[in-house]
């Protein structure tokens, strides 16, 4: 039978007795940088191509047994993963593979950076489809090693690493720390994560998306034929590097902007439990699990939005964080979080000729998160507009004037260290969608957004004493662009865009003791674009 | 994922002294700063990757490169240029004593400088 | 559920040989290393020998090196010890013990362990 | 002789807080190589108590606590129980011996 991890990626229409879903990755090349492999082994031979580069360190110990037939471990099950021919994601997949890691498992920072630009000048030398680089290890935070992965992310590579096996912090660790690379976490058969020994997967913000990593079934070193389970991050960012290059053979033009929206927009959401990962993590890390997409053919009349978050700003005072999205992808709308509740908001700014999103700490808080959320928008014409505290009772309002300019975000920034204490606005009137309202202590942000065949509309949910969480969804065909609360007291925490579902958490009164009776109501902007689905049904 | 200004848990070092007689100051008002890993078990002191600016060419690294390699000479230390980064970042990687840290850093070109550590199979 | 259980000890004579196996079930056996700790009767922990997840790294504690070889079957979920040349202070019960196998990134905690088998040398 | 030394016995009255130590040296605590303990409770295996240095797995009450600092770790045990009463051994990697190395055991006794 069809081993779980296959089916758990394998979309419905494709499950069968075995897997087989169309198109193998055949137009696509997978360059893994790992130990070395055995490439006559039947799952993987004439798939994968062993280059001559190897730069590894010696092995440790004197006093250490070394078997050199054993070295070809870890390697040889991930090219099994990728491309096995039994066992495999994308069978059709071609592969190259590099020695950056020594027997014992073990590489440098300087090695792989090598072992990167090899393949930098490989591709300039013979260029060729689509490439996949899988980087199935990890270190300590690396600024060299995230930056070479940057440069050859803009030249148009693809890379995919292990989001770490140290139950830590995804952020704390390379190349799974760069923002240009897919960095995936590990999850089991019962879709939860992998405990490995006392620790396991990574998680966090750092982390794109999850796979299946424990008890992986794939090609052993031990023999021409034999097979063998293994367990880690390493084998979860093989199944991402296989779906992604079926979704590169298929669509063969995808930027890495686009491959990353598409497999978080086709994963499983919300199936792990988020009670394994630490408390203060939970909010950061995607609940999502990679699958295969249900066709063949792009998904490109779908509106992509993927929310991102800023690191921690830190306690101080007037200490901001910034939230960035990736250069082929619109900034739609930006929020913030504090667990505290003690922020001062957030504003869309200009930085470097793209807008980012900035949320600012308030007195005594214990710091604040900025939320991104960042959509792919061909021919998009964004800006901002500003409108400075109103000082008045009905709140300060902003709306987008430009003729075809349609609302995607509000974000609100005050100065005030506790909204609180200010009698809150009253909710907007019905009728105004291309308007922000906030309190009128704050200044209040527009996003606007010209671009063929968008069209958005404003849908709220409110309740009327704050209760911990209020969410509203956007309906199928719809994209969460805009993520907001109103109003903007102390009671809230702040909003976030989950998938396609506003999230507004607020302190439970309950536990505060407040007898506020005021409402605390979600604020969702959904979108979708009439052109990006006529364009591809012109193309079918 | 991690922003470049975040606050990642590595030491950085901006190390500073009174100017080389025999280099050249780097551009006013930047400072080259050392970083290294934050797990004292993966890091690999004595092997470096000087990292460049942006826009340096293949001549001017193997050039800076050449340079340290003479101011270290004179004051009685030996290094060994592994290997000459282009193609992605311009740079190169050394083996030399931590010594002389201070004295790569104020190179003309240096933006920053990494000591080498671990990456592991997961 | 993860398990270990070990078996072949007993008594033996001095210079004379046994074989200890552990078989592990409930877990994915071929990512852990796998390691023996034996304890002399009355006394402390002693760790006595190493063996990574594929085989490819080993190591022996001093008291046993050129005596004693750890192996594996991943595919029969089984580690092993060889112990040749047994002494006297060879008597213990040896307990098998696993931990995820970081490739040296980090040493893990033995967090699963069998519950011992006894090996006697006497004459 | 071990590698990492511990106090041969410890006593405390029930309720009572007692701590353990563990002294290692620059190859091994002092390296930056985890501690982990291990509680033997008589005629049984060792359970795993606390991992890296200060993590308690599932199951093991709240009552028992890891640290580490420089070539040394302690473990201790507040509000001692009857039950608490067994064998304590620490455990790190050693780099110049290539692997791993446990404490000398230390016998706690609850009093009374």
């Known amino acids: 039978s069809i081993p779980w991890n296959l089916e758990r990626i394998t979309p419905p229409r494709y499950r069968a007795d075995e897997y087989q879903p169309p198109d193998g990755g055949s137009l696509v090349e997978v360059y893994l940088l790992d130990t070395s492999i055995q490439s006559d082994h039947r799952e993987i031979e004439g798939r994968v191509m062993v280059t001559d580069f190897e730069n590894v360190p010696e092995e440790d110990g004197t006093r250490f047994h070394r078997q050199a037939s054993k070295c070809d471990s870890h390697g040889t099950h991930l090219a099994g993963v990728v491309s096995g021919r039994d066992a495999g994601v994308a069978k059709g997949a071609s592969m190259r593979s590099l020695r950056v890691l020594n027997c014992q498992g073990k590489g440098t920072v300087s090695g792989t950076l090598i072992g990167l630009e090899f393949i930098r000048k490989s591709q300039l030398v013979q260029p060729v489809g689509p490439l996949v680089v899988l980087l199935p290890l990890a270190g300590g935070y690396s600024r060299v090693l995230n930056a070479a992965c940057q440069r050859l992310a803009r030249a148009g590579v693809v890379l995919v690493t292990a989001a770490g096996n140290f139950r830590d912090d995804a952020c704390l660790y390379s190349p799974a720390s760069a923002p240009e690379v897919i960095t995936v976490g590990a999850t089991n058969a019962q879709d939860q994560p992998v405990t490995l020994g006392t620790l396991g997967t990574n998680f966090g913000r750092c982390v794109d998306l999850f796979a299946p990593g424990e008890d992986i079934i794939g090609a052993s070193s031990d023999c021409s034929t034999c097979f063998v389970s293994q367990s880690g991050t390493s084998q979860a960012a093989a199944h991402v590097a296989g779906i992604a290059a079926m979704m590169l053979s298929a669509e063969p033009e995808l930027t890495l902007a686009e491959l990353r929206q598409r497999l978080i927009h086709f994963s499983a959401k919300d199936v792990i439990n988020e009670a394994w990962f630490p408390e203060d993590q939970r909010v950061l890390t995607p609940n999502l699990v990679a699958a295969l997409p249900p066709s063949t053919h792009g998904a490109g009349w779908q509106l992509f939005c993927r929310t991102v978050w800023s690191a921690h700003s830190g306690p101080t005072r007037m200490a901001t964080a910034i939230a960035r999205c990736a250069p082929d992808e619109e900034l739609l709308s930006c929020s913030s979080f504090s667990r505290s509740g003690k922020r001062r908001g957030e504003r869309m700014e200009a930085q470097g000729g793209k807008l980012v999103c900035r949320a600012h700490n308030a007195f005594g808080g214990e710091g604040v998160y900025a939320i991104a959320r960042c959509c792919l928008l061909p021919q998009a014409n964004c800006s901002v507009h500003t409108a400075p505290p109103a000082e008045a009772s009905m709140g300060t309002r902003v709306h987008c004037h430009q003729q075809g300019h349609v609302l995607t975000g509000c974000s609100s920034h005050w100065e005030v260290e506790d909204l609180g204490t200010h009698k809150p606005p009253v909710l907007r009137p019905r009728g105004q969608p291309n308007q922000c309202v906030g309190h009128r202590e704050a200044s209040i942000h527009a996003s606007c957004c010209h671009a063929p065949g968008l069209e958005c509309k404003v849908k709220e949910h409110g309740i009327p004493a704050p209760q911990g969480q209020v969410t509203v969804a956007c309906e199928e065909g719809w994209t969460l662009t805009g993520c907001s609360a109103l109003p903007g007291t102390s009671h809230v925490l702040g909003a976030y865009a989950v998938d396609n579902t506003c999230v507004v958490r607020s302190r439970d009164v309950s536990t505060t003791g407040s007898t506020s009776e005021e409402a605390v109501t979600a604020v969702a902007i959904c979108c979708r674009s009439r052109h990006l689905a006529q364009a591809s049904q012109e193309l079918q | 994922q991690e922003d470049e200004d975040g606050d990642y848990e590595e030491l950085v070092l901006a190390l500073r002294s009174e100017e080389d007689g025999l280099a050249e100051a780097p551009e006013h008002g930047t400072t080259a700063t050392f970083h290294r890993c934050a797990k004292d078990p993966w890091r690999l002191p004595g092997t470096y990757v000087v990292v460049l600016k942006e826009e340096t060419h293949l001549s001017q690294s193997e050039r800076t490169a050449r340079r340290l390699q003479a101011q270290a000479a004179r004051r009685g230390y030996l290094t060994k240029i592994l290997h000459v980064f282009h193609g992605l970042l311009p740079g190169f990687l050394v083996k030399m004593s931590g010594d002389l840290l201070e004295l790569a850093l104020k190179l003309p070109h240096v933006d920053y400088i990494e000591e080498d550590s671990s990456v592991f199979a997961q | 559920e993860v398990q270990l259980v070990e078996s072949g000890g007993g008594l033996v004579k001095p210079g004379g040989s046994l074989r200890l196996s552990c078989a592990a079930s409930g877990f994915t056996h071929s990512s852990y290393s796998m390691n023996w700790v034996r304890q002399a009767p009355g006394k402390g922990l002693e760790w006595v020998s190493s063996i990574s997840s594929s085989s490819s790294y080993i190591s022996y504690a001093d008291s046993v090196k050129g005596r004693f070889t750890i192996s594996r079957d991943n595919a029969k979920n089984s580690l092993y010890l060889q112990m040749n040349s047994l002494r006297a202070e060879d008597t213990a019960v040896y307990f098998c013990?696993?931990?995820?196998?970081?490739?040296?990134?980090?040493?893990?905690?033995?967090?699963?362990w069998g519950q011992g088998t006894m090996v006697t040398v006497s004459s | 002789e071990s590698v990492l030394t511990q106090p041969p016995s410890v006593s405390g009255a029930p309720g009572q807080r007692v701590t353990i130590s563990c002294t290692g040296s620059s190859s091994n605590i002092g390296a930056g190589y985890d501690v982990h303990w291990y509680q033997q409770l008589p005629g049984t295996a060792p359970k795993l108590l606390i991992s890296?240095?200060?993590n308690r797995p599932s199951g093991v009450p709240d009552r028992f606590s890891g640290s580490k600092s420089g070539t040394s770790a302690s473990l201790a045990i507040t509000g001692l129980q009857a039950e608490d009463e067994a064998d304590y051994y620490c455990q790190s990697y050693d780099s110049s011996l290539s692997g791993s190395v446990f404490g000398g055991g230390t016998k706690l006794t609850v009093l009374g």
């Open positions: 890296g240095n200060s």
């Open positions: 013990a696993r931990d995820y196998d970081f490739h040296s990134a980090h040493y893990d905690a033995f967090d699963v």
